[in-house]
């Protein structure tokens, strides 16, 4: 029953977890306008991984994609890339997990297979987890040298008669749900990891041992016993737990055109 | 066609308060912010503050907070201004002022302060 | 808050001129974030609501003559009529789009001579 928790929770858990990866990769606030030399901007930037936005006065927020490969710092490229990678492994992961639920039954798969599957995916998640945990990490870093960099140079030009700041970008919300994200499926495929454990037959089963009673032929031969799971192989009358395995949709919500500075 | 359809010309004597509207059409409301602006008479414009149609957010030229009160009824497509404390400075045109660029401007309300 | 400043206050011409007035900011109004100026010019005449000309410094309007245009970049920008028209005797405001409070300029009166 534990394992079949374990394995449920891992799953939920890692299903979240990967819908905050998608809409981390989706959306426009990876990096927002450091508001600290102007908190009374009219024109308000962010960008985000595929294109950057500008909301002006007007309430109007016009956004343009990069509509170019080679000419994106290698940096971003790098972040994109393991984001993908992370929702591409996730996804399998989410696959093949389905699969190995322990509440869901599939034909006369062997509970070795499941056991197989569920750490295969509990691999996918962790790995998954880790790329956009890298990816998040990699972009805030990289704003963080741009931050301190547009500072050293903040008032240039004109020597120094005309005011010109330059705009600086600093941590914006897809950072923290990338980060939540990552954590969640990470920890989901630690979680399947350890219910794979559970699920794995252990290699020496019990002999059959014959038992005589005085006054009685009798023999009991109990079937092999898997440690832990609490049923014997020869264990007819399993529980199958329809619906056990629940899809959580998390609403990732964007921030709107019309929330303003 | 968008357009802007402010209320009439208003006479008042020092201290009262006056509430204007700005009807809009032609546009979904809750698109653009919608910003005031007044003209004193011969004078350059001065912009007063503007709100958000969609969350009712506002955001005031530091000049008139305390003056004026922006506010929206997002079923009749409706912004409203109150202006309390009247003087005699405050004699002007308040224009309300919305769409890209600040582009579509109403015809603009007359407010007279005369005791 | 930004300052806006026009030069001349106003002008006499006479129709077929080419004009030129400035408007110069106490700070930039140049956005790196989409490489614009906000920066925007409105016409007015009298008893009227002001008319948007150009929006990020030099953009036209749709539907406002081509004889109109606007240059300039950071804190210095000029509106230029290439050809004044009887219909163009009116009052020219420039305007920061960029910070709150959005401010205009005194406004350049152009007249007939």
């Known amino acids: 029953m534990a394992v079949t928790a374990c394995q449920g929770l891992g799953f939920v858990v890692s299903l979240i977890g990967i819908a905050g990866i998608i809409a981390a990769t989706c959306m426009d606030q990876w990096s927002t306008q450091d508001l600290y030399n102007n908190p009374v901007t009219a024109v308000f930037n962010y960008q985000g991984l595929w294109r950057s936005c500008v909301r002006e006065s007007s309430g109007f927020t016009e956004c343009r994609g990069y509509f170019t490969l080679l000419g994106l710092p290698a940096m971003l490229q790098a972040v994109r890339a393991l984001m993908i990678v992370g929702i591409v492994l996730g996804a399998i992961g989410l696959l093949v997990s389905i699969f190995a639920l322990k509440c869901i039954r599939i034909g006369s798969m062997e509970d070795s297979a499941k056991a197989n599957m569920t750490l295969t995916s509990g691999i996918m998640f962790i790995v998954s987890g880790l790329c956009a945990i890298a990816g998040v990490s990699v972009f805030a870093n990289m704003l963080v040298t741009n931050f301190w960099m547009s500072t050293a140079n903040m008032y240039t030009g004109m020597g120094g008669m005309v005011q010109t700041v330059q705009t600086r970008y600093t941590f914006g919300a897809a950072l923290f749900v990338g980060w939540v994200a990552g954590g969640l499926t990470l920890i989901g495929g630690v979680m399947m990891c350890i219910a794979c454990r559970g699920l794995a037959p252990e290699e020496t089963n019990y002999k059959a041992v014959s038992y005589h009673a005085s006054g009685h032929s009798v023999a009991y031969k109990p079937g092999g016993f898997k440690a832990s799971t609490g049923f014997g192989s020869n264990t007819k009358n399993k529980k199958i737990y329809d619906g056990g395995a629940r899809t959580e949709d998390e609403v990732q919500s964007y921030p709107s055109k019309h929330d303003y500075v | 066609e968008v357009q802007l359809v402010q209320s009439g010309a208003e006479v008042k004597k020092p201290g009262a308060s006056v509430k204007m509207s700005c009807k809009a059409s032609?546009?979904?409301?809750?698109?653009?912010?919608m910003h005031w602006v007044r003209q004193a008479p011969g004078k350059s414009l001065e912009w007063i503050g503007y709100i958000n149609p969609n969350n009712g957010g506002t955001s005031y030229n530091q000049k008139f907070k305390g003056k004026a009160t922006l506010t929206v009824n997002k079923s009749s497509s409706t912004a409203y201004m109150e202006l309390s404390s009247l003087r005699s400075e405050d004699t002007a045109v308040y224009y309300c002022v919305t769409t890209r660029y600040l582009a579509v401007w109403g015809q603009g309300t007359t407010v007279t302060v005369s005791s | 808050d930004i300052v806006m400043t026009q030069s001349p206050s106003s002008l006499s011409v006479s129709v077929g001129d080419r004009v030129t007035m400035t408007c110069k900011s106490s700070q930039s109004l140049f956005n790196s974030g989409n490489q614009k100026n906000y920066l925007t010019w409105y016409q007015q005449k009298p008893g009227k609501a002001p008319k948007l000309l150009i929006y990020w410094a030099s953009t036209r309007e749709s539907g406002v003559p081509d004889r109109f245009s606007g240059s300039g970049s950071g804190t210095d920008f000029t509106l230029t009529i290439s050809s004044v028209q009887p219909e163009d005797f009116a009052t020219y405001f420039c305007?920061?789009?960029?910070?709150?409070?959005?401010?205009f300029g005194g406004g350049t009166k152009l007249e007939i001579k």
């Open positions: 305007q920061n789009d960029y910070s709150y409070p959005l401010t």
């Open positions: 032609g546009y979904t409301f809750t698109d653009y912010n």
